[in-house]
Interface confidence: medium
């Protein structure tokens, strides 16, 4: 969570001198309560905007919006607090909207915005504002919050902003797996632009079970530039497991601009189609367990074996 | 009520420059996206490209070595530019807003929408390609 | 790209029917999906958005619902401003593509 650093967010408006400054999220008057407090903010929206920075990178930004209610506790108003929440990791942010005139009437409805909070692919978020001063030990609150869902980076518009471009959003692999037998898989692919090496990870399951019967990783080498944007086949050796018939294809890349991070994208082979009495599965045990430290998946020849090439 | 106009020449010679201009008028163009789509005599809708307030613009690969969409924030204008044009380009031209996204609220607990998709177009120009 | 397919092309129908219109996706789209109606000369108009909310000033008679890659919009009581031609749009995934229409026409 940061806040965009340009341009200079404003918050005064006609009829409102106003400024905008950083706050620790623990307003004055939490320690020092006042009798006479504003009512809640009304009708609060978070929008998904884009913002560009100087650099010209393009960031997700949360647009937070909201009015007042048309009483007379603005006599009362000295600004409010905006604080936004990571839900997953219980990071906050917060700035102040300072009030450096009184709000005397309503003739027209107050409305504020605030599109300077930066926010990350698929995180969720808890948006609330304040009204200052925060009320008294008691009383009637005076905030009002949303939670707010950014999008992944699949989604059309995410696709493009920095964060997600910077973990490989714009390769598209195209991935298809073929049964080759029941031995075999071909796995052709689209590399990306970049001389950065690939790993295949194969899990493989029995029909309707989750419980992996067989699990491969194969590590396909860098390509050369000629190669850029060609595809790529590997042919994948399966353990002959009867029943082991569902497979997951897994291409991570490690692209230089998120290493060991960047999006992973999948395809799934299912089973044939069951006869109407299938003869039972056996309950399979992963083949080994995942060293402490290492990968969740390791290469192993004894396990499967694979061969690649590249197509021009 | 936000509305959009387009404007341009109604009839281009085939290997010129087919330019077309969106007028967007009752709102501002900021923190919108702005697309062009086009629909050929008694054919579908094809979507030919979008741009962003700040520039930032995505094009239908179909039609990408062709094309240029640009903004005019002063303006409240973005325009089109399609290069080297031939018979197969006449069609009706529509400007079209992608909405905003927001998030809706159910009973008693919430719901995300990313909603882009045209929600407010123009009435569209139909551009002929002849000598 | 994303190929939208619709079902049926086009159909006949009297005042009152119930009307259903089908739009698959090639790959998934989660409910990144609008309906749009299209009357001869006019530009197309927004009917749903995010697959199944109706758009605001859209007569309650019109609806949607799917997810992933197979959707449907309903007419429930065809009435005579519904007969025009109805398409679907994803905008899941860049290039945004369309439906090839359903043209709804008096039986």
């Known amino acids: 969570l940061r806040l965009l650093d340009f341009p200079a967010p404003v918050c005064a408006q006609e009829g409102l001198s106003c400024r905008v400054k950083n706050s620790t999220c623990l307003d004055d008057s939490w320690i020092h309560p006042r009798n006479l407090t504003p009512s809640s903010p009304k009708d609060l929206q978070i929008q998904l905007h884009f913002a560009h920075t100087q650099q010209g990178d393009l960031f997700p930004v949360a647009h937070i919006e909201w009015t007042l209610q048309t009483d007379a506790s603005i006599l009362y108003l000295e600004g409010a607090e905006l604080s936004v929440l990571q839900l997953n990791t219980n990071e906050r942010l917060c700035v102040r909207f300072e009030f450096l005139s009184k709000l005397r009437h309503h003739h027209r409805r107050w409305r504020f915005t605030f599109s300077h909070f930066v926010v990350d692919p698929d995180q969720e978020y808890e948006v609330t504002v304040h009204h200052l001063p925060k009320p008294i030990p008691d009383g009637d609150p005076n905030h009002q919050s949303k939670n707010f869902l950014v999008p992944d980076c699949e989604h059309a518009r995410m696709k493009v902003t920095t964060p997600c471009m910077s973990s490989g959003s714009l390769w598209d692999p195209n991935i298809t797996v073929e049964t080759l037998d029941t031995q075999h898989l071909r796995v052709d692919f689209t590399l990306w632009n970049e001389s950065t090496h690939y790993q295949i990870l194969l899990t493989s399951f029995p029909h309707m079970e989750n419980h992996s019967c067989f699990e491969h990783m194969h590590h396909i080498p860098a390509p050369r530039p000629e190669e850029f944007h060609q595809r790529s086949n590997v042919t994948l050796t399966l353990r002959n497991l009867k029943g082991c018939c569902r497979h997951q294809v897994q291409i991570q890349p490690f692209f230089s601009s998120c290493l060991n991070d960047c999006l992973r994208h999948s395809a799934t082979v299912s089973c044939p189609e069951m006869p109407d009495t299938p003869e039972p599965i056996p309950d399979y045990m992963p083949l080994w367990e995942p060293r402490s430290g290492s990968s969740d998946y390791k290469d192993d020849d004894d396990k499967g074996s694979s061969h690649h090439h590249h197509h021009h | 009520q936000v509305q959009l106009q387009e404007s341009g020449p109604g009839l281009v010679k085939p290997s010129e420059t087919l330019s077309l201009t969106c007028t967007v008028s009752?709102?501002?163009?900021?923190?919108?996206?702005w697309n062009w789509i086009r629909q050929s005599p008694g054919k579908g809708l094809e979507w030919i490209g979008d741009?962003?307030?700040?520039?930032?613009?995505n094009y239908n690969p179909s039609l990408k070595s062709r094309v240029t969409i640009s903004v005019d924030t002063s303006k409240n204008q973005f325009s089109l530019k399609l290069s080297s044009v031939t018979t197969a380009d006449t069609a009706v031209y529509y400007c079209?807003?992608?909405?905003?996204?927001?998030?809706?609220?159910?009973?008693?607990?919430?719901?995300?929408?990313?909603?882009?998709?045209?929600?407010?177009w123009g009435q569209g120009t139909t551009v002929t390609v002849s000598s | 790209d994303i190929l939208m397919t619709q079902s049926p092309s086009s159909l006949s129908a009297s005042v009152g029917d119930r009307v259903t219109i089908t739009c698959r996706a090639s790959?998934?789209?989660?409910?990144?999906l609008g309906w749009y109606q299209q009357k001869p000369g006019k530009a197309p108009k927004r009917l749903i958005y995010?697959?199944?909310s109706l758009q605001s000033g859209v007569p309650s008679r019109f609806s949607g619902s799917g997810s992933g890659t197979e959707f449907t919009l309903t007419i429930s009581s065809l009435q005579p401003e519904d007969f025009a031609t109805y398409y679907c749009?994803?905008?899941?995934?860049?290039?945004?593509?369309f439906g090839p229409g359903t043209k709804v026409d008096i039986k």
């Open positions: 790959q998934g789209i989660r409910n990144d």
């Open positions: 741009i962003y307030y700040s520039g930032s613009t």
């Open positions: 079209a807003r992608d909405g905003e996204l927001a998030n809706y609220y159910g009973s008693g607990s919430y719901q995300f929408y990313y909603y882009y998709g045209m929600d407010v």
């Open positions: 995010a697959a199944s």
């Open positions: 749009l994803q905008h899941n995934s860049n290039p945004f593509t």
């Open positions: 009752g709102g501002s163009i900021s923190n919108y996206y």
